[in-house]
Amino acid sequence: SEVEYIAEVGQNAYLPCSYTPAPPGNLVPVCWGKGACPVFDCSNVVLRTDNRDVNDRTSGRYWLKGDFHKGDVSLTIENVTLADSGVYCCRIQIPGIMNDEKHNVKLVVIKPAKVTPAPTLQRDLTSAFPRMLTTGEHGPAETQTPGSLPDVNLTVSNFFCELQIFTLTNELRDSGATIR
């Protein structure tokens, strides 16, 4: 099943997707669509690139802010709303019959809440779960080690926080790790 990424209403969401151009500089078209990857192309295209640049974007909120020319085609959605929630398809359109790479990622947009977890717990959660999203320009939590995480305050709802703590506790227990 697709990996979940979480963003708060009003923040920027980051949906990772990348490929390695072979040879370097040999870019391929990419499309991002709202909805799971279909058989061909993308449905409900939100952004499309050709071999050189972004050539189709349905809204000014959709951006490729990574190094597009090195294959980082991660999608940033600015100022997300609840309506942005859902599955997105990143399709890397490698030439040839049925050669495309298809990646479904799920964006969960949550309402801002008042609970701020303690810094240590926050770092553990964001490093342990790809479902957690850092906001803005920092990219996905799973690409950063706990020591290098930016000092941003992620606010989460009580339910979400308890769910993550419960899941983290069980995963650590299953792995034999010590729970702090």
Partner: antibody
Framework: EVQLVESGGGLVQPGGSLRLSCAAS????????MTWVRQAPGKGLEWVAN????????YYVDSVKGRFTISRDNAKNSLYLQMNSLRAEDTAVYYC?????????WGQGTLVTVSS | EIVMTQSPATLSVSPGERATLSCRAR??????LAWYQQKPGQAPRLLIY???TRATGIPARFSGSGSGTEFTLTISSLQSEDFAVYYC?????????FGGGTKVEIK
Amino acid sequence: EVQLVESGGGLVQPGGSLRLSCAASGFTFSNSWMTWVRQAPGKGLEWVANIKQAGTEKYYVDSVKGRFTISRDNAKNSLYLQMNSLRAEDTAVYYCNSGSNYFDYWGQGTLVTVSS
Amino acid sequence: EIVMTQSPATLSVSPGERATLSCRARQNFYSNLAWYQQKPGQAPRLLIYGASTRATGIPARFSGSGSGTEFTLTISSLQSEDFAVYYCQQYNNWPLTFGGGTKVEIK
């Protein structure tokens, strides 16, 4: 207004060949995937083949692979289906569609009858 | 090949009544499903795509719902022009496949 007009259908003997054409207008043909769907008399719909915008990728249902060839001429806004080694089970109305996954525009269809 | 099962095969409904058509599959299609209407002697017409999005010009009495393996097309109040055959079509897996159709007839 989008228009898709198929032609080239008719009666052909088993083992024979036909070339269907579809003339497109009212949309940017060169930016669109194009598809053939068929419907045997009194039966349901069956996807047959489709082709990417530049013609670089073509896909076929297994039952027609090696016998049918889809092609396009973007300069003429035209889609084609070359049908060889025709069989009785290829008898159907053939529809030309714009779209890759689902089909928002359809032609009126052209009837292909394979019979001796 | 993915088999799409539509039920019922025939649905007898009176004008003004509600019609509910079902389309089922054995695997997850997310929302990659479309519905078409076909009247005798005519080409099919796209009604719904993405399981629930109405195509351009389609009246609000047509609605689609469901995701995964079970999908529904609902016609809230049948008009005389709605009596036709309805097909679902999945576009999540190759090859693209259609259901066998549901004929909606006048009761």
